[in-house]
């Protein structure tokens, strides 16, 4: 009686269960009454990452430098190439098909999380007691200067964009 279902890593064709090709190999010929499945290794710059019956291997992803991309991990016959972005840039999507410049945090905002090759800069507003007076992709909010520890007094209050201005204590009693 011909099978209606096959074991794991097999497929049903012409009423026979044939072995799938292992990762890194493509299907040439289905198994027959006389032969096992015929598989061939993927060529240079090709891959297949699953047990399969594909007759063509997939092309490795190309990390296009014109799009700001570079190779993070070279592909093998069983894995695709992984692209990442050049320094100062990050991927626009999970697939990392193109890159954009990391955003900078405006004055009044500091870097909460520095950008990586796959994620943009995360900014946060500087809370009371902190400031940022530059547009930067790296600078965090800095704490206001503590005038007291310098034996000085606040002459001008700080904001989220400016530090406090300290001055000498009024000596008149």
């Amino acid at each position: 009686e011909p099978p209606t279902a096959c074991r794991e890593k097999q497929y049903l064709i012409n009423s026979q269960c044939c072995s799938l090709c292992q990762p890194g190999q493509k299907l040439v010929s289905d198994c027959t009454e006389f032969t096992e499945t015929e598989c061939l290794p993927c060529g240079e710059s090709e891959f297949l990452d699953t047990w399969n019956r594909e007759t063509h291997c997939h092309q490795h992803k190309y990390c296009d430098p014109n799009l700001g991309l570079r190779v993070q991990q070279k592909g093998t016959s069983e894995t695709d190439t992984i692209c990442t972005c050049e320094e100062g840039w990050h991927c626009t999507s999970e697939a990392c098909e193109s890159c954009v410049l990391h955003r900078s945090c405006s004055p009044g905002f500091g870097v909460k999380q520095i950008a990586t090759g796959v994620s943009d800069t995360i900014c946060e507003p500087c809370p009371v007691g902190f400031f940022s007076n530059v547009s930067s992709a790296f600078e965090k909010c800095h704490p206001w200067t503590s005038c007291e520890t310098k034996d000085l007094v606040v002459q001008q209050a700080g904001t989220n964009k400016t530090d406090v201005v300290c001055g000498p204590q009024d000596r008149l009693r």
């Epitope: 012409n14 072995s19 040439v28 010929s29 027959t32 009454e33 006389f34 032969t35 096992e36 015929e38 061939l40 007759t55």
Partner: antibody
Amino acid sequence: QVQLVESGGGLVKPGGSLRLSCAVSGFSLSRYSVYWIRQAPGKGLEWMGMMWGGGSTDYSTSVKGRFTISKDNAKTSVYLQMSSLRAEDTAVYYCVRTDGDYWGQGTLVTVSS
Amino acid sequence: ELQLTQSPLSLPVTLGQPASISCRSSQSLASSQGNTYLHWYLQRPGQSPRLLIYKVSNRFSGVPDRFSGSGSGTDFTLKISRVEAEDVGVYYCSQSTHVPWTFGGGTKLEIK
């Protein structure tokens, strides 16, 4: 439908060469394997070798080094190049597809002086 | 090279009676993937061989159910439950597990 047709047989002197062709139709040689079998007059069947779909070849010990199997995917033909022929190579040569029961009609090779 | 030994060489049978042919291999015919590529052919007089049984026990399409195959490892058998006139010819076992593929020497079935 699937067909295999052999040609190229004939009379050849010992030490001579001959090329048999197996023209196929109804299937692709890049997806199916084909093998050659021979049968000497009044004798049994002998497997000569095969051409796999992927292009690799295998041979029997009796003909390895003397016979070469090749194929032309575009011309849809498989060839058996026979050299240094001997009297014991006299036989009907069949090409066969490696699934189902698809045989050519056979072509007779006679090696005699 | 793997040898297939068939017995008997000649098999005279009365019409309607059963017949049995043995095929012994010089090494196991189980493949690395668990398949056993042992097959049976019938060559009728003046014709090319015709596939009867593939992979030990699978009847090829159009083959009458009076033909059956069995066995494993190195010992295999072809049985005909009731011989008919059209069954006359030479029966060959064949293996395609190991390269080079090989055939048995043949068993000639004739009617008594």
